[in-house]
């Protein structure tokens, strides 16, 4: 499901129930995410010994995933709403391409894999209506994401074990980072 | 042995600076969150501040401006250098290992304290 | 910013005895809080986390239970190992805050 249980109209229409404002489906959408890729990380652990490698062993590689810097306005020093929140979105948009890649990388969390992937697009939903600024966010080209795919999927097995790997630490770390600088808004 | 070691507590005058340690042995420190904690005599405890994976830090209101925390990968440390220190900063500090697989903090592994005592 | 307040301060008890110790957070943390233990001279060790889930190796007779701002840490049958100082610690946000940990509570010998 792409939504946590609880957060359908239904249940949030039910009586006994206030109904969750923006910033608490928002926070709510993203524990659901962080725990589908814990699933998703015990699986890739437990085929190889990955997880155990400091990041310094497996920081040579040609991905150029997500990651907040300061200038992105989300850390507690120098933080900004409007840059974050803008940060947070194009993020998520550029991690979609990897979270396609990791579709059928899974054997018994296939559908933890697609869960993942459909939450992160309702996230990103729930998000771009929480932003002013909506004119500073890029959406990645479709023709690059195409072609990072197909390159991404001609990898060796090893490879794409590791990027199976990194995608999922990458994506956790910028939801964790995510998290934490909305909570301060 | 899975383990933190905390080091470089001692006797500081006041506006003075220190740098503490905490070296990690048994795992890499580049893959945890790692926060400082500290025990004033007879007192609870403080939380102080915490270095996250991409090398975000957050601070207590004490702290901010006046400490911060860092890290060497290459030596498996993390530091806490604290400039114009004051009495009230007379404390056991702690440094804690967050396993960092959650989105909650909670520090499930920690050093055995170092002391610092800032007096004239 | 998020303050924690721990209640109460200490307590004295028997060996056998139920103990409660409660934790009130200024504003909703979900579920995110643990608690600690401490001897004297001794580092803090983690016996709960997520309000309710027992650390490895944490005696059973360690409960916790709670959610929102209110929240409790129980322990079923007072042991001589157990006379110690008990910690709360919201985990929800670590940014603004003046200490994430509430201030204590000493369990001693009654």
């Known amino acids: 499901a792409p939504v946590p249980p609880g957060e359908d109209s239904k249940d949030v229409a039910a009586p006994h129930r206030q109904p969750l404002t923006s910033s608490e489906r928002i926070d709510k959408q993203i524990r659901y995410i962080l725990d589908g890729i814990s699933a998703l990380r015990k699986e890739t652990c437990n085929k190889s010994n990955m997880c155990e490698s400091s990041k310094e062993a497996l920081a040579e590689n040609n991905l150029n995933l997500p990651k907040m810097a300061e200038k992105d306005g989300c850390f507690q020093s120098g933080f900004n709403e409007e840059t974050c929140l803008v940060k947070i979105i194009t993020g998520l948009l550029e991690f979609e391409v990897y979270l396609e890649y990791l579709q059928n990388r899974f054997e018994s969390s296939e559908e933890q894999a697609r869960a993942v992937q459909m939450s992160t697009k309702v996230l990103i939903q729930f998000l771009q209506k929480k932003a002013k600024n909506l004119d500073a966010i890029t959406t990645p080209d479709p023709t690059t994401n195409a072609s990072l795919l197909t390159k991404l999927q001609a990898q060796n097995q090893w490879l794409q074990d590791m990027t199976t790997h990194l995608i999922l630490r990458s994506f956790k770390e910028f939801l964790q980072s995510s998290l934490r600088a909305l909570r301060q808004m | 042995e899975v383990q933190l070691v905390e080091s470089g507590g001692g006797l500081v005058q006041p506006g003075g600076s220190l740098r503490l340690s905490c070296a990690a042995s048994?795992?890499?420190?580049?893959?945890?969150?790692v926060t400082w904690v500290r025990q004033a005599p007879g007192k609870g405890l403080e939380w102080v501040g915490i270095i996250y994976g991409s090398d975000e830090t957050a601070y207590a209101t004490s702290a901010i401006g006046r400490f911060t925390i860092s890290r060497d990968n290459s030596k498996n440390t993390l530091y806490l250098q604290m400039n114009s220190l004051r009495a009230e900063d007379t404390a056991v500090y702690y440094c804690?290992?967050?396993?960092?697989?959650?989105?909650?903090?909670?520090?499930?592994?920690w050093g055995q304290g170092t002391l610092v005592t800032v007096s004239s | 910013a998020i303050q924690m307040t721990q209640s109460p301060s200490s307590l004295s008890a028997s060996v056998g005895d139920r103990v409660t110790i409660t934790c009130q957070a200024s504003q909703s943390i979900n579920n995110e809080l643990s608690w600690y233990q401490q001897k004297p001279g001794k580092a803090p060790k983690l016996l709960i986390y997520?309000?309710?889930t027992l650390a490895s190796g944490v005696p059973s007779r360690f409960s916790g239970s709670g959610s929102g701002t209110d929240f409790t840490l129980t322990i079923s049958s007072l042991q001589p190992d157990d006379f110690a100082t008990y910690y709360c610690?919201?985990?929800?946000?670590?940014?603004?805050?003046?200490?994430?940990f509430g201030g204590g509570t000493k369990v001693e010998i009654k």
């Open positions: 804690a290992r967050d396993d960092s697989s959650d989105w909650d903090a909670k520090f499930n592994l």
């Open positions: 997520r309000a309710s």
């Open positions: 610690q919201q985990g929800y946000s670590l940014r603004n805050i003046d200490n994430a």
């Open positions: 048994g795992f890499s420190l580049s893959n945890y969150y």
